[in-house]
């Protein structure tokens, strides 16, 4: 067991341009307070998961009123440390969220109003018992300077607060197998105190209060032999490789107590001991009030109407959850139309539109042909965010500016010669063939397989392809 301690040194405008406006004014005096949330491991620091290592709320700082015309200075801070007690081992790696809250002290109906000024988050490695670590974090135009440390509560010592120390019984040395407790050389490491009643033969512990069973034993105190009747192989419980020994359920399996309540079994059921701020038979009811600033991410706190709901958080856009602790994945609603890319910037949603579309949600199909003329009598065709020209005969290319060579595809059959003409192409057919593309043979007796040639054209004359 131990305590995580956080000391806020300053909160004010960060370096660089764009100094923030003071959060308080003569018309609206205010004061600051801080909230810290800790989670074990290098977990995501987004506020979705609960503060599993603990959370703390500072006292309110002194009332501050901005001097007209003056830039926002470092704001007056609450006295004292923020302390987050932890009951079990210190994890060594942790994630933190520190929120700076403003309490407005104007004449609001229903008492003071709270709003979130800044929120910083990070992941750190920290050994318990070490010196204060200093940190600077920026949130927008604000800068927060703070120090933190983790310290063990006696008799626990060590970087994880899992070793126990006791004063020496003899002046010269510690007992068998027990080392001196650095840095407290006048104390000795104490043997771990397992859970009361934990079987000395079949149980052991790696942390105080724990009772872990040796293979073949189960139950909360490791006093129950595991049945081997369901083993698939003949190996007995003494075998280190047996795959059939399933430890029995521990006390309060699946901890049914909500909100970090501690659970103890009763003969037929269980009982919950609730942490501060929660009550109810299963610790399911929050006893936190708006005075504790429970709404994250700028949520507005309103006193609950019924006694089982001491407060209600009205969340700003982009957040949800009973404490506005969950960021809404607004892009999952696919708000960007016409294939636009969705970007959730936290304070706003942005859509990056594909070519040919515009608008906040890419809902406007741009007039692809606006201002785009197709040359040489071509007509513009819209489609899919791009324009296309349908070109007049004899022209091609994106804008119909290129003259097409109608003979490039060798359209005249049976050796006919092709001539480009202003309105298309003309085939001069080889003897014995006729037709627009020289595709029809002329019969040997001079008659054509086609109807008679139009007046003014003899078989064998060049045929114009219109």
């Amino acid at each position: 067991a131990g305590v995580f301690e956080l000391q806020i040194h300053s909160f004010g405008p960060g370096p660089g341009p764009g100094a923030p406006r003071s959060p308080c004014s003569a018309r609206l005096p205010c004061r600051l307070f801080f909230r810290v949330c800790l989670k074990p491991g290098l977990s995501e620091e987004a506020a979705e998961s609960p503060c599993a290592l603990g959370a703390a709320l500072s006292a309110r700082g002194p009332v501050y009123t901005e001097q007209p015309g003056a830039p926002a200075p470092d704001l007056p801070l609450p006295d004292g440390l923020l302390q987050v007690p932890f009951r079990d081992a210190w994890p060594g790696t942790f994630s933190f969220i520190i929120e700076t809250w403003r309490e407005e002290l104007g004449d609001q109906i229903g008492g003071p109003a709270w709003s979130l000024l800044a929120r910083v988050a990070g992941r750190r490695r920290l050994a318990a018992g070490g010196p204060w670590a200093r940190d600077i974090q920026r949130a927008g135009a604000w800068e927060l300077r703070f120090s933190y440390r983790a310290r063990c509560e006696p008799p626990a010592v060590g970087t994880a607060c899992t070793r126990l120390c006791r004063p020496r019984s003899a002046p010269s040395r510690c007992g068998p197998g027990l080392r001196p407790c650095a840095p407290l050389e006048d104390e000795c490491e104490a043997p771990l105190v397992c859970r009361a009643g934990c079987s000395p033969e079949h149980g052991f512990c790696e942390q105080p209060g724990e009772c872990r069973c040796l293979e073949g034993w189960t139950g909360p105190l490791c006093t129950v032999p595991v049945s081997t009747s369901s083993c698939l192989s003949p190996r007995g419980p003494s075998s280190a490789t047996t795959g059939c020994l399933v430890p029995g359920p521990g006390p309060c399996d699946g901890n049914p107590c909500a909100n970090g309540g501690s659970c103890s079994e009763t003969p037929r059921s269980f009982e919950c001991t609730c942490p501060r701020g929660f009550y109810g038979l299963r610790c399911e009811v929050s006893g936190v009030t708006c005075a504790d600033g429970p709404c994250f991410n700028g949520g507005l706190c309103v006193g609950g109407a019924d006694p089982d709901s001491a407060y209600i958080c009205h969340c700003p856009p982009g957040f949800q959850g009973s404490n506005c602790e969950k960021r809404v994945d607004r892009c999952s609603l696919q708000p960007c139309r016409n294939g636009g890319l969705c970007l959730d910037l936290g304070h706003a949603l942005r859509c990056r539109c594909r070519a040919g579309f515009a608008g906040p949600r890419c809902e406007h199909d741009l007039d692809d042909c606006a201002g785009r003329a197709c040359a040489n009598g071509g007509t513009c065709v819209e489609g899919g965010g791009a324009h296309r020209c349908s070109c007049a005969l004899g022209f091609g290319g994106r804008d119909c500016r290129e003259r097409a060579d109608p003979c490039a595809a060798r359209p005249c059959a049976h050796g006919g010669r092709c001539y480009a003409h202003f309105s298309g192409l003309v085939c001069a057919c080889a003897p014995g063939y006729m037709g627009a593309r020289c595709e029809f043979p002329v019969h040997p007796d001079g008659a054509s397989a086609l109807p008679a040639a139009p007046p003014g054209l003899r078989p064998g004359d060049p045929q114009r392809y219109l």
């Epitope: 359920p249 399996d253 699946g254 049914p256 009763t266 003969p267 037929r268 059921s269 269980f270 009982e271 919950c272 009550y279 109810g280 038979l281 299963r282």
Partner: antibody, heavy 116, light 106 residues
């Protein structure tokens, strides 16, 4: 052996408040959990809520806004109030004793009918 | 809230039969499950708690097993007094009952 005797209920009109009381004989009403459970005709049992000796309650979320369970340890009694009743509240109501969420001794049951 | 589903809804059996009733929870309830027996016009009677612990005074032919989301009540040799409706109940989070399984004479 603990015995539970319950009374109240009967025929109610819609929007009225149902009141039931359960007396505990042969045991104390401290150190236990006291529950109310109901069973609409031909349907499954439904947990209404429970209270412990210190007065901490837990209610079925679907009924929470209308339910009040209280305990009077001096009289060895506990009671149920259900406001704004409708025909859907017609059921046999049982009081019970036990541990958290579990009932090992039951009252005889009281039929409550809601009809205009 | 947690939904409890029993199967079968009705079971026809004879005296001496081995009978098994299944109860499924919509989410894990660890082993916080009880079984009750109810006869027409009577209050339910607790048989099993913590999924497998036999309530005092209940015959040993009744047994319970399971954890998490799947549970069973077994009557090893059905007796004339056992024809009744059986309910499972979770008490991990508030309390909810299954719809009941009626064991009737075949």
């Amino acid at each position: 052996q603990v015995q539970l005797q319950q009374w109240g209920g009967g025929l109610l009109k819609p929007s009225e408040t149902l009141s039931l009381t359960c007396a505990v004989y042969g045991g104390s009403s401290s150190g236990n959990y006291w529950s109310w459970i109901r069973q609409p005709p031909g349907k499954r049992l439904e947990w209404i809520g429970e209270i412990n000796h210190s007065g901490t309650t837990s209610y079925n979320p679907s009924l929470k806004s209308r339910v009040t369970i209280s305990v009077d340890t001096s009289k060895n009694q506990f009671s149920l109030k259900l406001s704004s009743v409708t025909a859907a509240d017609t059921a046999v109501y049982y009081c019970a004793r036990g541990e958290l969420g579990i009932a090992d001794s039951w009252g005889q049951g009281t039929l409550v009918t809601v009809s205009s | 809230d947690i939904q409890m589903t029993q199967s079968p809804s009705t079971l026809s059996a004879s005296v001496g039969d081995r009978v098994t009733i299944t109860c499924r929870a919509s989410q894990s309830i660890s082993r916080w499950l009880a079984w009750y027996q109810q006869k027409p016009g009577k209050a339910p009677k607790l048989l099993i708690y913590k999924a497998s612990s036999l309530e005092s005074g209940v015959p040993s032919r009744f047994s319970g097993s399971g954890s998490g989301t799947e549970f069973t009540l077994t009557i090893s040799s059905l007796q004339p007094d056992d024809f009744a409706t059986y309910y499972c109940q979770q008490y991990n989070s508030y309390s909810t009952f299954g719809q009941g399984t009626k064991v009737e004479i075949k």
